[in-house]
């Protein structure tokens, strides 16, 4: 920032609440879509341009005027892998976090016209092109259909789909939210011959029911019913099938071949948790027991002579955890070599750090190709010579991210491709590789303004800057912006990282109010090197509040010793560590220890509430948005991963003594704002309703706000503005700010 160190002499405006709510200062992205190993699509002024990666020249792929007469607002588009057709998405209707329904039309790029025959039906739940060519698979009314050609009729693959009961090729609520992070449960083989799919059966899954009030004119509220397995409840069951799309015919039903779960899974409740095609005729499936410390990978080959899929027991790979659960949130996906005979996978090593291990399909043991007291975040690309990965190794900062390549013929030859490109500005990278990894886009998201650059893998040479946010930089020169401090404290000989958003002209000799912004769920990270323009930016810039976040026990990317510390004990160490962090911050000399607040959303709302109910005396006030209040209210897959089952034989005791309600009495010592959306399908309004009831029952005065018909994100324009305005008032009142 230009200006002076003296706040009083700085006449520049601050970053205001209105700036946040109205998004006055916009970060520019550079969202590209690779269509080959040397070309990508980029949308500019609603024209779709095709760029040559090597030379940077572009041509118009599709003019913005093409669909002027279309009559619908196009929500999204998708080009077939052979570049012959474009799928247009409109009539988008959101369902849950990832799921939605929409209408689709197909435009023939050669004929320059819409295909009018054999159209995809309205309210389609999912559509996907085959990886090559232009076959289409889609799900409508919970059944799967395939189109061999866009203008040909659809072949119906399944006939069992039933709303809220049987889901073919799409996930039910809990699989969408907690397992696949997607609505799709369809997987094309690499050349589009086979279509694999999961079928979920929710027949016995209990329903969550809540009112949806809708328009004022609706006399009786609608009741929304969703199959939602809470902790310990009956779970969905899953089956897995593969269909050969070359076999499809209108006059006979498609034959789907089932691949059953391994015997070690069939003995009890289990999940399908990963599907990865290894070759055209080899598929890997990962299955996970309901008690999520044991998983099995099956590798299955197509037997042409029988038309069946065979999964040899000798090729099974077991992954288990003795200290917690498998994977960060689920077992990681394998990255197969071209021949499909070996793969690379991120797993926990002996020291409990997540690293890349090399597996051969016929051997049980694997060879770690990375090691150290840091973690590999993700495998980004695999070629015949190199594996590319993102890790937080650089400078020992868990909150950083850099791109590395490792030579497959010599694992000691590791190069960091991003570390030294722009070390002050850029410490947190993600990457997007072209189809065969000849080129890659680096996306730097902090600590400076986001920077997008294009690179060649041949020599790792930077080709060009795609977006540097210079316009935003110029605008922000005229704003008193906060600074960000990323550091660690040592507790019990362990480093724990924190970040602080510090007011402009921060003076460590002064006393500032502090707001602890908390999430603290398993494998979370709130202390990082990312640049953000958010509510905290306003609080620091305009209200001179320090906004801090702390990654305590249970947080991720620093080894299992830290992450698994809260195994079977949610609501303990991660809560205590936030309190301890606040104590440590108040000892730093620049925090007004009479004005410390805490706030969080979702898991952060739970931790906020548990902290405020702890009776620590550290916090004056706090805000919990959409909090969990009792783990028996939350979904089975997430909750049981960390808590086991709410049964006397397993972990019922801790389920019962980790509730917010049991701490109601202690809320008399704090100011509390409780907020929840009434149509929250994820953390049900029930959770806040029970907190409210418990507080009322012991005579605690508190503030509350509900958001009618809002879900877990409270993201509609009006509700978003209202909640942040409301919370701002609450914090300002708590801190006695004008």
């Amino acid at each position: 920032n230009k200006g002076t160190d003296d706040a009083t002499a700085d006449s520049r405006k601050t970053y205001t609440l209105t700036d946040y709510l109205k998004n006055t200062y916009r970060l520019k992205l550079y969202s590209l879509r690779w269509i080959s190993d040397h070309e990508y699509l980029y949308k500019q002024e609603n024209n779709i341009l095709v760029f040559n990666a090597e030379y940077g020249n572009s041509s118009v792929f599709l003019e913005n005027s093409t669909f002027d007469e279309f009559g619908h607002s196009i929500n999204d588009y998708s080009i077939s892998p052979d570049g012959q057709f474009i799928l247009l998405e409109y009539n988008y209707v959101k369902q849950w976090r990832h799921s939605y329904t929409a209408s689709y039309d197909i435009y023939d790029l050669n004929k320059r016209q819409l295909i009018t025959e054999e159209r995809i039906p309205n309210n389609t739940q999912w559509v996907t092109w085959s990886p090559v060519g232009h076959k289409l698979a889609y799900v409508w009314n919970n059944d799967i259909y395939v189109k061999i050609e866009p203008n040909l009729p659809s072949y119906r693959i399944t006939w069992t789909g039933k709303e809220d009961i049987i889901y073919n090729g799409i996930t039910d609520w809990v699989y969408e939210e907690e397992v696949f992070s997607a609505y799709s449960a369809l997987w094309w083989s690499p050349n589009g011959t086979f279509l694999a799919y999961a079928q979920f059966n929710d027949t016995e899954v209990p329903l969550i029911e809540y009112s949806f009030y809708s328009d004022e004119s609706l006399q009786y509220p609608k009741t929304v019913r969703v199959p939602y397995p809470k902790a310990g409840a009956v779970n969905p069951t899953v089956k897995f099938f593969v269909v050969n799309t070359d076999s499809l015919s209108s006059v006979t039903n498609a034959t789907s071949i089932q691949i059953t779960a391994p015997a070690s899974m069939l003995i009890g409740d289990h999940y399908l948790c990963d599907v990865t095609w290894a070759t055209q005729e080899r598929i890997s499936l990962q299955w996970l027991r309901r008690i999520q410390n044991y998983s099995v990978m099956d590798i299955c080959d197509y037997d042409e002579s029988s038309g069946r899929w065979n999964c040899l027991v000798a090729r099974q790979h077991i992954e288990m955890s003795t200290t917690g659960w498998v994977g960060r949130f689920r077992p990681s996906e394998p990255h197969f070599t071209l021949d499909g005979n070996s793969f690379y996978k991120i797993i926990s090593n002996e020291e409990g750090y997540r690293h890349i291990c090399y597996f051969q399909i016929d051997k049980k043991d694997c060879t770690f190709i990375t090691k150290g007291t840091w973690e590999v975040i993700g495998i980004e690309a695999l070629t015949s010579d190199y594996l590319y990965y993102i890790s937080n190794e650089y400078k020992g900062m868990p909150g950083g991210r850099n791109l590395y390549k490792i030579q497959l013929s010599d694992y000691t030859k590791v190069t960091c491709l991003s570390c030294e490109l722009n070390p002050e500005r850029c410490q947190y990278y993600s990457v997007s590789f072209s189809k065969e990894a000849k080129y890659y886009q680096l996306r730097c998201s902090g600590p400076g303004l986001p920077l997008y650059t294009l690179h060649s893998s041949v020599n790792d040479k930077g080709l060009r800057v795609l977006e540097d946010n210079s316009a935003l930089d110029k605008m922000l020169q005229n704003v008193q912006m906060p600074s960000k401090k990323l550091d660690f404290i040592i507790l019990n000989e362990t480093k724990f990282w924190y970040q602080m958003i510090l007011p402009p002209h921060f003076d460590k000799s002064k006393k500032y109010p502090l707001l602890l912004d908390v999430y603290a769920g398993p494998c979370s990270q709130k202390a990082d090197t990312v640049f953000r323009l958010n509510w905290a930016t306003y609080l620091a810039s305009t209200e001179n509040i320090i906004v801090a976040s702390f990654d305590g026990r249970g947080s991720g990317y620093q080894g299992d010793k830290i992450m698994h510390a809260i195994n079977r004990r949610l609501g303990t160490f991660e809560v205590e560590d936030q309190i301890e962090a606040a104590r440590q911050f108040s000892k730093m000399g620049f925090v007004d220890n009479k004005r410390i607040a805490i706030w969080g959303w979702s898991y952060g709302g739970y931790v906020t509430s548990m902290v405020l109910g702890s009776g620590s005396g550290v916090f004056k006030c706090g805000i919990a948005v959409a909090p969990v209040s009792r783990w028996e209210y939350y979904d089975s897959v997430y909750t049981e991963r960390y808590m086991g089952l709410p049964t006397p034989e397993d972990n019922l005791d801790h389920y019962r003594n980790s509730t917010v309600m049991s701490r109601a009495e202690n809320f008399k010592q704090v100011e509390y704002l409780l907020i929840h959306g009434t149509a929250d399908d994820n953390v049900h309004f029930q959770q806040s309703a029970q907190i409210s009831k418990a507080l009322v029952d012991v005579g605690v005065d508190f503030q509350a706000m509900w958001y009618t018909d809002e879900d877990h994100g409270i993201a509609s324009s009006t509700a978003h503005q209202h909640i942040y305005t409301h919370m701002s008032h609450f914090i300002k009142q708590c801190f006695s700010l004008p």
Partner: antibody, heavy 116, light 107 residues
Framework: EVQLVESGAGVKQPGGTLRLTCTAS????????VHWVRQAPGKGLEWVGV???????DYDAAFMSRVTISKDTSKSTVYLQMNSLRAEDTAVYYC??????????WGQGTTVTVSS | DILMTQSPSSLSASPGDRVTISCRAS??????LNWYQQKPGQAPRLLIY???NLHSGVPDRFSGSGSGTDFTLTISRLEPEDFAAYYC?????????FGSGTKVEIK
């Protein structure tokens, strides 16, 4: 290269049994269905039946009681067996590969004559 | 069974002529109609699938149209090698049925 070759041509006795073989190459019988069609001299094409990739069969009702289509995937062969032959069964018999809803490859045909 | 009626049963034409052959289904078969060409002493070969889609390797002088019950095969400019029999076939319902054929002869 996809090919279908029929064999089993010849003169058959009325009341006798016909067994034709269709040898397939260049594709898998577990993926594609194989149909049989016949053509009487100077006449049009008449569908007899099909064996699908998964082994299920369908027949024209006119042949249901006396026709069996089977296959040996290890030998890449499909068989058509027809019992109780009569003079009207005299025809060229073709096997064809089913590609979705059309026949994209045909055998050259094999001639069967039913005569005493 | 679905009855497929082809017309005419035969026609005479000269090279360079435009020829149309008609096929009618006894019930709605949507677009599930294929056309085959058969030369004397040879097996039929696929020309057009699903009413209007040209099979690979088939010259573009052949075209198909229609849906529901009425379909047409058109040869825009007859070539000497096009003199043959042409059959339509429905593929929407078993049993599969063919038209009785149209013989295109040299005038």
């Amino acid at each position: 290269e996809v090919q279908l070759v029929e064999s089993g041509a010849g003169v058959k006795q009325p009341g006798g049994t016909l067994r034709l073989t269709c040898t397939a190459s260049g594709f898998s019988l577990t993926t594609y269905g194989v149909h049989w069609v016949r053509q009487a001299p100077g006449k049009g094409l008449e569908w007899v039946g099909v064996i699908w990739g998964d082994g299920r069969t369908d027949y024209d009702a006119a042949f249901m009681s006396r026709v069996t289509i089977s296959k040996d995937t290890s030998k890449s062969t499909v068989y058509l067996q027809m019992n109780s032959l009569r003079a009207e069964d005299t025809a060229v018999y073709y096997c064809m590969r089913n590609r979705h809803d059309w026949f994209d490859y045909w055998g050259q045909g094999t001639t069967v004559t039913v005569s005493s | 069974d679905i009855l497929m009626t082809q017309s005419p049963s035969s026609l005479s034409a000269s090279p360079g002529d435009r020829v149309t052959i008609s096929c009618r289904a006894s019930q709605d078969i949507r677009n599930n109609l294929n056309w085959y060409q058969q030369k004397p002493g040879q097996a039929p070969r696929l020309l057009i699938y699903y009413s209007s889609n040209l099979h690979s390797g088939v010259p573009d002088r052949f075209s198909g149209s229609g849906s529901g019950t009425d379909f047409t095969l058109t040869i825009s400019r007859l070539e000497p090698e096009d003199f043959a029999a042409y059959y339509c076939q429905q593929s929407i319902k078993l049993p599969l049925t063919f038209g009785s054929g149209t013989k295109v002869e040299i005038k």
